[in-house]
């Protein structure tokens, strides 16, 4: 099950966030979320994973694009984009289920 | 010490949208560390999860009430919401705000009674 | 959908006694995710274990936790009278989120 958490082997990763503790961190996967706030310019962080893997899952939307990945360091270089704006008439569905 | 304090209306009619929303304090929402939900507990009752989001905004929903559920974040404001439309009296509940982290459900708000009735 | 099962629905012992609580999940579950809470009439849950068997910051001794696969419990080694209350076990970190229905742990 892709789902489940996992505690198993763990991997550094780049962090690039308000919160990171230091350039790396460990954890079970390697993540680069790009979120665009209301009025804002978009912001990507990078970091590391241990819950919740369904996240990687969701489709990008004109407000957030979430990466994973499994390896050393592998989020170093990833850049991600937003979908462009959708039509007023749609609804953007951050709700991966 | 992170704390959470859910806020609301205590009464709600049927039909109409509950609405909640969760302070925090002591921590920042923003961190990727953590998941923010909200749970409810009927009247003696066990609980039931509601649905979660991660700072991005992205959110989760139990599926049993996804068609109705919305959860919101406003990280300049430090807080999350819930809202609930369609209410009925099965709705009445004590509802919850909760941090999930690595160490499981570690803060919860200490909830809020809300009823559904005209 | 995981169902997690927690027996017996109601446990009667006297203080001093040890309690031993059941949960089992319809299909086998991370044990790294699996959590127990107390509750007392009129308060929020209160973490007492996560990782099957890591106590909560300020979690006294006396609880434990141990399990894997699809059998958890929860071990209370000697009852204090503050310990009678509701404890749930509960799947975390992946979707669905699921809690047991709890066992009722009651005097004797």
């Known amino acids: 099950d892709p789902v489940k958490p996992s505690r198993g082997p763990l991997v550094t990763c780049t962090c690039e966030s308000p919160h990171c503790k230091g350039p790396t961190c460990r954890g079970a996967w390697c993540t680069v979320v790009l979120v665009r706030e209301e009025g804002r310019h978009p912001q990507e962080h990078r970091g590391c994973g241990n819950l919740h893997r369904e996240l990687c899952r969701g489709r990008p939307t004109e407000f957030v694009n979430h990466y994973c990945c499994d390896s050393h360091l592998c989020n170093h270089n990833v850049s991600l984009v937003l979908e462009a704006t959708q039509p007023p008439s749609e609804q953007p569905g951050t709700d991966g289920q | 010490q992170v704390q959470l304090q859910e806020s609301g209306p205590g009464l709600v009619k049927p039909s109409q949208t509950l609405s909640l929303t969760c302070t925090v304090s002591?921590?920042?929402?923003?961190?990727?560390?953590?998941?923010w939900n909200w749970i409810r507990q009927h009247p003696g009752k066990g609980l039931e999860w509601i649905g979660y989001?991660?700072?991005?905004?992205?959110?989760y929903y139990n599926p049993s009430l996804k068609s109705r559920v919305t959860i919101s974040v406003d990280t300049s404001k430090n807080q999350f919401s819930l809202k609930l439309s369609s209410v009925t009296a099965a709705d009445t509940a004590v509802y919850y705000c909760a941090r999930e982290s690595v160490a499981g459900f570690d803060y919860w708000g200490q909830g809020t009674l809300v009823t559904v009735s005209s | 959908e995981i169902v997690l099962t927690q027996s017996p629905g109601t446990l009667s012992l006297s203080p001093g006694e040890r309690a031993t609580l059941s949960c089992r999940a319809s299909q086998s579950v991370s044990s790294s995710y699996l959590a127990w809470y107390q509750q007392k009439p009129g308060q929020a849950p209160r973490l007492l274990i996560y990782g099957t068997s890591s106590r909560a910051t300020g979690i006294p001794d006396r609880f434990s936790g141990s399990g894997s696969g699809t059998d958890f419990t929860l071990t209370i080694s000697r009852l204090e009278p503050e310990d009678f209350a509701v404890y749930y076990c509960q799947i975390y970190g992946s979707i669905p989120i699921t809690f047991g229905q709890g066992t009722r742990l009651e005097i004797k």
């Open positions: 989001i991660y700072y991005s905004g992205s959110t």
């Open positions: 002591g921590g920042s929402i923003s961190s990727g560390e953590y998941y």
